[in-house]
Every structure is written in C-alpha cells, then in structure tokens.
C-alpha cells in the first residue's frame, strides 16, 4: 500500500480552479525527492503534467503550479481555468512516475450548474456587494417589483417595492427603481454571505403579464493564498478589499478553532500581545488597500490568516475578506540572532543584524518600533551616513563583521532606550529582524570622564578604564561621526585603579589629542572588540575653547561634568531627502510609515527576527 495520500475524487466546474494537496511521510529523502502530477493514459502509462523540478506540460502552461511544503510532508498542485478536457484519472506521487509511490486522483470537471434559460450569473466574493438588474416592460412600470429566492421548490420573497424586506437581509439590501426613462429596477445586496448564494427570480407585476428574470448568485469564499516563509523571516499580507470599504475599520486575524478568528492587528488600535514589537499595519491607500508586515516569524505563527473590513475591527458574517495559509519553514536560511539584548543605564549595547549575504552592497537600516496607532518604525540610522539628530554621538551602524551581518552600537543608554528595534536593508525584504533592548540594573563596565573641555593648541589626555574581564579584548579609542567611528591612536597606561577587586589585568587606556584644534571637538568613544565583533563602548564629548592659561589638560574621572546619560546635545535636525524614504526597494511593497513629528527625520518602516536567545550588552 502506498504511503501517499490525497483526495480520491475532485469535482469542479468549467472555469474554476482546484488545489489538490498530496501528503507524504516527511522523511529526509521524501522531502527532497521529485514530486509530480501525471495523467493516467488508457494503456496504463502516466504522462507528467507538472513536477517539482520545474517541468510544466504545454497543457498546463500558465495555469498550474506545484509547490512542495517539506516540513509538512505535503505538496500542492494548483490548476486554474479548468475545462471538461481536464476530466480524467491522475496520480500525485514522489520519485519516478512508474515506481508506485503515488496516489490515484479522479478529477471531474462538469459544465456548471444547469441554469434556466435567460439566467444571468452573478459571481461575487464573500462580503462584497452584488447588484441584480431586473428589466420590465412599460405596462408593468407602476406595478409591484419584487425579488424572490428559490429555496428548494418554493420561491421565498426577499424584498419588494412595497417596503417588505426578508429578515435574513435586514440592513443590507435595497431595491432601486431607475428614473422613468429606464425600464429597469435593481436590487443591491451588501455584505454577501455564503448562504445568499442560489437562484433568484425578479418580477415586475403579479399577474400573467408580469415580467420575470432569473439570476444565479454564486458567492465565492476566498481560496487561501499559500504563503511560505522562513523561520525568523518576515511576511507581508497585502489586503485589497476595494474602495467601497475604504472608510471601514480594517483587521488581520488568525483563525483558531472553528469560526473564531483572533484579531492580530486592526485599525482601531488593537494588537495581539504575541505580535508586540514585530508587526506594522501600513496605512491604507485611498482605495482601501493596506498591508501588514510581521517579522521574526515563529513556528507558532503558521496558520490561516484573514484580512477584512468591519466597523467592529474583527471578523463578522458578511465581512469582505482575503485569506492566506502561512507555512513557516523551519529549515530557515535566516541565521539565529539574539532577540533580546541587555544593557545598563549609562552603558551600551552592540546588536548584530543579519542580512542576505548575497546583498552585501545593500543599504542597511535600523529603526525603533513604536506601538502607537497601528505601529510605525521611524529610522534612526543607515549605512549611508544618516543618523537621527537625537542619536548623534551615541549611535553607529558598522558594516562589520560583514558577510551577512552588520553591527549597530548604541551607548549612553537610558531607560527610554528600552524597546523593540528592527534591522533591515533595501534588498531582500524577507530578511528583517527584531531585537528587544532591555535596560537592567547595574553599572557600565567602562569608566570614562563625563564631558571634557579641551583648550585650543594644547594637549588633552582622556582616560578610559577597562575592568579585568576585558583583558583578552582589543581596546580602542575612536572619533564618532555619522558614517562610523574612526580609530585613533591610544596609549596603554597600565593597570587601572578605578575598580575594586580587579587585578593587574584591568587597564587604563588613554586618548591623547596633541595641539588641539576646533576640528577635534566632538564625540569620542572608547570600546572593546574581538576581531570584527564589537563589545561595550563608552562616549565622551570633547568641547574646545580658547586658551585661558598655559599647559596641557589631563582629565581624570573626578573631573567628570555629568553622567553620560544626562548629556543633552542640542544640535539641530538634519533634514533628509525623500529619496531615502521613497526608495522603491526599501520595503519592496511596503510603504514608509511616518507621522508629522518625524517627517524631518525621515521615518521609515522596518523589520524582525526571532529566537529565544538573549544577549548581554557586552557579549558577542
């Protein structure tokens, strides 16, 4: 007996599509072997129509596809534009057509429902609106107009021109009689339900001279679009429900049991806790379309999602909807990276951001997720030298270590820095990762003075104290600018006396600025790294002033002006060009998410990843 399983009979009608799922034991060999769909011939052979290796028969060109879902042990054959010629016996199978690892499927395509003569067919999606047009003759212009639905053998009145409305249609149906010039009345039914489908009869007049018109209403439940994304990657659901619901609340929900569809996010401000920090509902266009980005995909995110429109912001009978079946591939190409990074007030974090290594030249971005309204992610820094004004001197995006990872360093941490941040590029939109920064109790490991004043023409020496835990790390000083942090020469001055219970392995490393000039003013960082992997940093602002008295300045910790997190740097906003915001590849299809407060800073939306690992501020 073959271990392959599928539908034994599939019945459909001309013009329709079918989606045939075949199940196989998900062994390693089966997952990677050839999958096929073939038609059985009269003499026993089986002619391949489509396979997972890219073959598509000319009979199926442009109307069929085969998708393998290895972690589920299934593959799906979609066939569109069915005709009666497609009726027959088929096999779905693995390996070679003749080897027996297959399942027999009978496909029967019929002409479609038998319709009465002169029947107009209306095919409308669930939740949408249909207008049934009913012509009549002049002699019936003043007579009663009505619409009936055929239930079994009996016509049941749905609506008439005297004001009657069947209770099943209350609040969503109307009968319009056109102006005197047109011999036509229309019945408009909104928020269509599956139960509305069937045969209708519209009638003008009640006697033997009445005018009658038959209508067949087909209400289509949307077939879920199959979406297949990698664990830790991201998915974008594009929802286009039509301009008629442009002003109605929108939602994305995930079906749990039965008809229950738990709201993931909606335009009324609701958001499921499981998606905190990793979801954006992008503002809708005038036509009512919108998109939802979910990043840091988890195994448990797999399932059936619906987007829709309803004033309640959740699924109701008659909501227009779109559907997706999301599969999350656990054999992910996106590497694990910490989803939580911890730092202390006044300290720093170094965040590693993965990107698609084939896109090393792409622009890298980092943004801060904000949960207000539908979620937004204003940009903080990019790899082209732009840094949001409030972050000058304490934020840097480094291309290192490269080969699929870049680094973001944020120092002078305060409790306000706690939150979710997204890493992204203007390349592969699936590679978006989220990291949560948590501010925990503790003291910064690196000790530097507060803000320092240097004197023009003199020498300035700034100390940085490294505890013994960093004895094996490379220690450096650098000068911050908006493209990175340029390394400077520094002197190891031996063990530091700034640490209690710390042996000879602690270090005092000084930065010396000889013959200070105005150009030396700015932010300086001392830090530790191992190769291209960065650890903690500490920042000092050096101001430059005119000479008052001769001599050089040697700054000690005792001369610090203020704690690093108390520094307020008043340097005006830099207005960035819209080209960065509107780069069409930045979100592929997503739009920038902005509000007026951050227009000058170029707010842009962004990204996520998911693993349960945590990373401390000083770890790699």
């Amino acid at each position: 007996k073959s271990p392959i399983f599928g539908p034994e009979e599939v019945n459909s009608v001309e013009g329709n599509s079918v989606s045939i799922t075949c199940y196989y034991p998900p062994t390693s060999v089966n997952r990677h072997t050839r999958k096929y769909w073939c038609r059985q011939g009269a003499r026993g052979g089986c002619i391949t129509l489509i396979s997972s290796e890219g073959y598509v028969s000319s009979k199926y060109a442009g109307r069929a596809n085969l998708t393998n879902f290895p972690e589920n042990g299934t593959f799906v054959v979609n066939i569109a534009q069915l005709s009666q010629d497609d009726s027959g016996r088929y096999k779905c199978g693995l390996g070679i057509n003749s080897r027996g690892l297959s399942f027999d499927v009978s496909l029967e395509v019929s002409q479609g429902p038998g319709l009465l003569n002169d029947t107009k067919v209306y095919t409308v999606d669930l939740g949408r609106t249909v207008t049934i047009n009913c012509p009549f003759k002049t002699e019936n212009a003043q007579k009663r107009k009505s619409l009936y639905k055929q239930i079994g053998l009996y016509p049941v009145l749905v609506i008439d021109s005297s004001g009657y409305v069947n209770p099943n249609y209350t609040g969503r149906i109307r009968l319009d009689i056109q102006g005197t010039g047109q011999l036509l009345f229309s019945v408009v039914i909104n928020q269509l339900r599956l139960s509305d489908a069937g045969q209708y009869l519209c009638q003008a007049g009640d006697d033997s001279n009445s005018n009658k018109k038959n209508a067949d209403l087909q209400v289509l439940k949307p077939e879920p679009e199959l979406v297949y994304e990698d664990l830790r990657g991201s998915v974008t659901f594009h929802c286009a429900l039509g301009p008629e619901v442009a002003n109605v609340a929108k939602f994305l929900c995930r079906q749990s049991s039965g008809e229950n569809c738990d709201v993931v996010v909606n335009t009324l401000g609701k958001r499921a806790p499981a998606f905190e920090g990793r979801i954006l509902l992008n503002p809708q266009d005038k036509d009512g379309s919108f998109s939802v980005v979910i990043t840091g995909l988890r195994k448990e995110d797999a399932g059936r999602y619906l987007c829709g429109a309803h004033s309640d912001g959740q699924l109701q009978e008659g909501s227009p909807i779109q559907a997706w079946q999301l599969f999350v591939n656990e054999e992910s190409t996106i590497p694990r990276s910490p989803t939580v990074v911890k730092g202390v007030a006044g300290g720093s974090v170094a965040v590693l951001c993965p990107y698609n290594r084939k896109e090393s030249k792409s622009i890298k971005y980092w943004c801060l997720w904000e949960g207000a309204q539908n979620g937004r992610c204003p940009l903080l820094v990019d790899s082209e030298g732009w840094v949001k004004a409030q972050y000058e001197g304490r934020l840097s995006l480094l291309e290192e270590p490269g080969n699929g990872t870049f680094t973001v360093i944020l120092n002078q941490l305060t409790s306000r820095d706690a939150g979710f941040y997204w890493c992204l590029t203007n390349g592969d939109t699936l590679w978006r990762t989220t990291v949560e920064i948590k501010i925990i109790e503790g003291e910064p490991n690196l000790k530097v003075p507060g803000n320092v004043t240097a004197v023009l023409g003199e020498t300035l020496k700034v100390p940085c104290h490294f505890p013994c835990k960093f004895s094996s790390y490379e220690k450096y000083w650098c000068k911050w600018n908006n493209t990175g942090c340029q390394a400077l020469p520094s002197q190891d001055e031996g063990p530091s006396k700034a640490f209690v219970n710390c042996d000879e392995n602690s270090r005092l490393v000084s930065l010396t600025l000889n013959l200070v000039t105005r150009a030396d003013e700015g932010w300086y960082w001392c830090g530790v790294k191992q190769g291209h992997f960065y650890g903690e940093t500490a920042a000092v602002y050096v101001a430059v002033e005119e000479r008052k008295a001769a001599g050089s300045r040697d700054v000690s910790l005792a001369k610090a002006d203020a704690a690093p997190d108390e520094k307020v740097l008043d340097s005006g906003f830099r207005e960035i060009e819209n080209k960065a915001i509107q780069d069409p590849r930045l979100f592929a299809e997503e739009k920038a998410v902005a509000d007026t407060r951050d227009q000058a800073d170029g707010s842009r939306a962004s990204v996520d990843s998911g693993s349960s690992e945590e990373q401390g501020g000083s770890s790699r």
Partner: nanobody, 126 residues
Framework: QVQLVESGGGLVQAGDSLRLSCAAS????????MGWFRQPPGKEREFVAT??????????YYADSVKGRFTISRDNAKNTVYLQMNSLKPEDTAVYYC?????????????????WGQGTQVTVSS
C-alpha cells in the same frame, strides 16, 4: 458554535448497506471541511472519509479500508453530509462520528477538527 447531529446507525448483516447523515446547525457559514471518523470497540478513533468544498469545487478523501465501498456526499441546502456504506463487514462495527472544521492541514487527523457530534453506533453481524 456549530452543532453536529449524526443519525442512521443501526444493526445490519454483513453485506448490507447503511446511510449515515450528519446535520450541521449554528454558524456554519465558514465550515467547509466535514468528515466521518469511527471508533471500533477498544481501539483508537480512525479516519473514514472527508469531504471539503470551496465554491463549486468538492474534494473527497477516503481511508484505504473503505475505498470502493463507502461514499461521502453533501447537500448544501440542508447543511447535511452523508456516508453511504455498502458491502458492510463485521470489522466496520464502530461508533461513527461526524466532525467539522474551517480548515484542516491533514484530513485524516482527528485533532485537526474543531467540532464533533455525539456519534452513532453501527453494528455489523456476520
């Protein structure tokens, strides 16, 4: 909620036929997968047949043990699914359950179904 009520079970001789019905009521507007499972005495619940539909397309799935003998069908107007059982064998003796769901990843897996009926007894004597 969706309520499922099975009927049509009974005691028959081997080789006879029976037709089981499962009537669905309640909010059935999104339910489009309905199946039959059975639980023989002292055994686990097992898959028998499933019918699923989308628009005017219908998919029918059968267990190997009933292929060619059992037929699953539906009547949308009555919200009812039927299981026509021909050439019954003593090993078909079981409590037959109707199950329904909006979507199932694998129609053979009982845990994929959200709603269940109370069951109807089918006994086939030799």
């Amino acid at each position: 909620q969706v309520q499922l009520v099975e009927s049509g079970g009974g005691l028959v001789q081997a080789g006879d036929s029976l037709r089981l019905s499962c009537a669905a009521s309640g909010r059935t507007f999104t339910t489009y997968v309905m199946g039959w499972f059975r639980q023989p005495p002292g055994k686990e619940r097992e898959f028998v047949a499933t019918i699923s539909w989308s628009g005017s397309t219908t998919y029918k799935y059968y267990a190997d043990s009933v292929k060619g003998r059992f037929t699953i069908s539906r009547d949308n107007a009555k919200n009812t699914v039927y299981l026509q059982m021909n050439s019954l064998k003593p090993e078909d003796t079981a409590v037959y359950y109707c199950a329904a769901s909006t979507v199932v990843a694998d129609p053979r897996a009982p845990n994929e179904y959200d709603y269940w009926g109370q069951g109807t007894q089918v006994t086939v004597s030799s």
